[in-house]
């Protein structure tokens, strides 16, 4: 039975030209992290594998970063980059959890964090 | 030991499909991903495309976008290529690798597609 | 796409003697989270697929003998032979993958002089 909940940053929002972090903790569950994917819609933006460490896409090289922790970080962000962002947690023996994030990204220099939120 | 084999040569007509197969063993198939590069007779080496068996990602040359399909099946470790609408410029060794991300570190043997009418 | 333009096409070392092959991308390779250099260096022989030599620019892959070796960063590269062995001549590829399509050199064929 999967017990865990996945804790995301939830909304976002972030100045144009500016980076954000985007994190998810898995908690709740005493199974074993293996992979964690970043997905934007359905691209692959990073894997951090337990055993391989931490794979980026090519396409994303110039704006991704691996990091803080098993979260990302997007930079020279555009309008663009507005959307759904996807954190999915390989386990074992529970199987796949996944966050979900939602970022905004804003011309104005008015760009507040949302609240957190919990996804089970 | 980490080992790809690759399915035999094949002789093919122009117009048809090819479907070369390449087989992991020695590793966990789901971690890495599986690249396809091909070489003409005499020529350099062309990255096809890749594919990771542990998600849906693949990712393709756009040369061959919309002739190159890469699937992975992971209940036999294996990856496959198919290429249509063959011409005689598809004549080639096409080679499978193994990818992370310091390099492609495992190639397979290769398998030689033929076109000829 | 990145282009890898190698040099020289073709190179004849006596056995004993320093062999050096040039790689230029036409773009920066260098990852700017972990400096380092997404660079390879192959080596092909006849009928055999290519093997690898060095990664991420200057680090020697497992069994690759000592005398290979891998320097530069971002668009200029040199794959080094420091005493050319019979064993060694063999066709010689870089290629980037920093940003798909990955891309190879058009080969440099090492030669006995």
């Known amino acids: 039975m999967m017990t865990g909940t996945i804790e995301t940053t939830g909304n976002i929002s972030a100045e144009k030209g500016g980076s954000i972090i985007l994190q998810c903790h898995l908690s709740s569950t005493t199974a074993q992290v293996t992979q964690v994917n970043w997905e934007q819609q359905d691209q692959l933006l990073a894997i951090c594998n337990a055993d391989l460490g931490w794979h980026i896409s090519p396409s994303f090289k110039d704006r991704v970063a691996p990091g803080p922790g098993l979260g990302l970080t997007l930079q020279s962000l555009t309008v663009n980059d507005t959307g759904e962002y996807f954190c999915i947690y390989h386990t074992y023996p529970d199987g796949t959890y996944t966050g979900r994030i939602f970022l905004e990204v804003l011309e104005s220099s008015v760009a507040e964090h949302g609240a957190r939120f919990q996804i089970p | 030991q980490v080992q790809l084999v690759q399915s035999g040569a094949e002789v093919k007509k122009p117009g048809a499909s090819v479907k070369v197969s390449c087989k992991a063993s020695?590793?966990?198939?789901?971690?890495?991903?599986i690249h396809w590069v091909r070489q003409a007779p005499g020529q350099g080496l062309e990255w096809i495309g890749d594919?990771?068996?542990?998600?849906?990602?693949?990712n393709y040359n756009e040369k061959f976008r919309g002739r190159v399909t890469l699937t992975a099946d992971t209940s036999t470790s294996t990856v496959y290529m198919e290429l249509s609408s063959l011409t005689s410029e598809d004549t080639a060794v096409y080679y499978c690798?193994?990818?992370?991300?310091?390099?492609?570190?495992?190639w397979g043997q290769g398998t030689t597609v033929t076109v000829s009418s | 796409d990145i282009v890898m333009t190698q040099s020289p096409d073709s190179l004849a070392v006596s056995l004993g003697e320093r062999a050096t092959i040039n790689c230029k991308s036409s773009?920066?390779?260098?990852?700017?989270?972990?400096?380092?250099?997404?660079l390879a260096w192959f080596q092909q022989k006849p009928g055999q697929p290519p093997k690898l030599l060095i990664y991420?620019?200057?680090t020697r892959e497992s069994g690759v003998p000592d005398r290979f070796s891998g320097s530069g960063s971002g668009t200029d590269f040199t794959l080094t032979i420091s005493s050319l062995q019979a064993e060694d001549l063999a066709v010689y590829y870089c290629?980037?993958?920093?940003?798909?399509?990955?891309?190879f050199g058009a080969g440099t064929k090492l030669e006995l002089k």
């Open positions: 690798a193994r990818y992370y991300e310091s390099a492609m570190d495992f």
């Open positions: 020695g590793y966990t198939f789901t971690n890495y991903w």
């Open positions: 594919i990771y068996p542990g998600g849906r990602y693949s």
């Open positions: 773009q920066n390779l260098l990852y700017n989270s972990n400096q380092k250099s997404y």
């Open positions: 991420w620019a200057s």
């Open positions: 290629q980037q993958y920093y940003n798909y399509p990955f891309t």
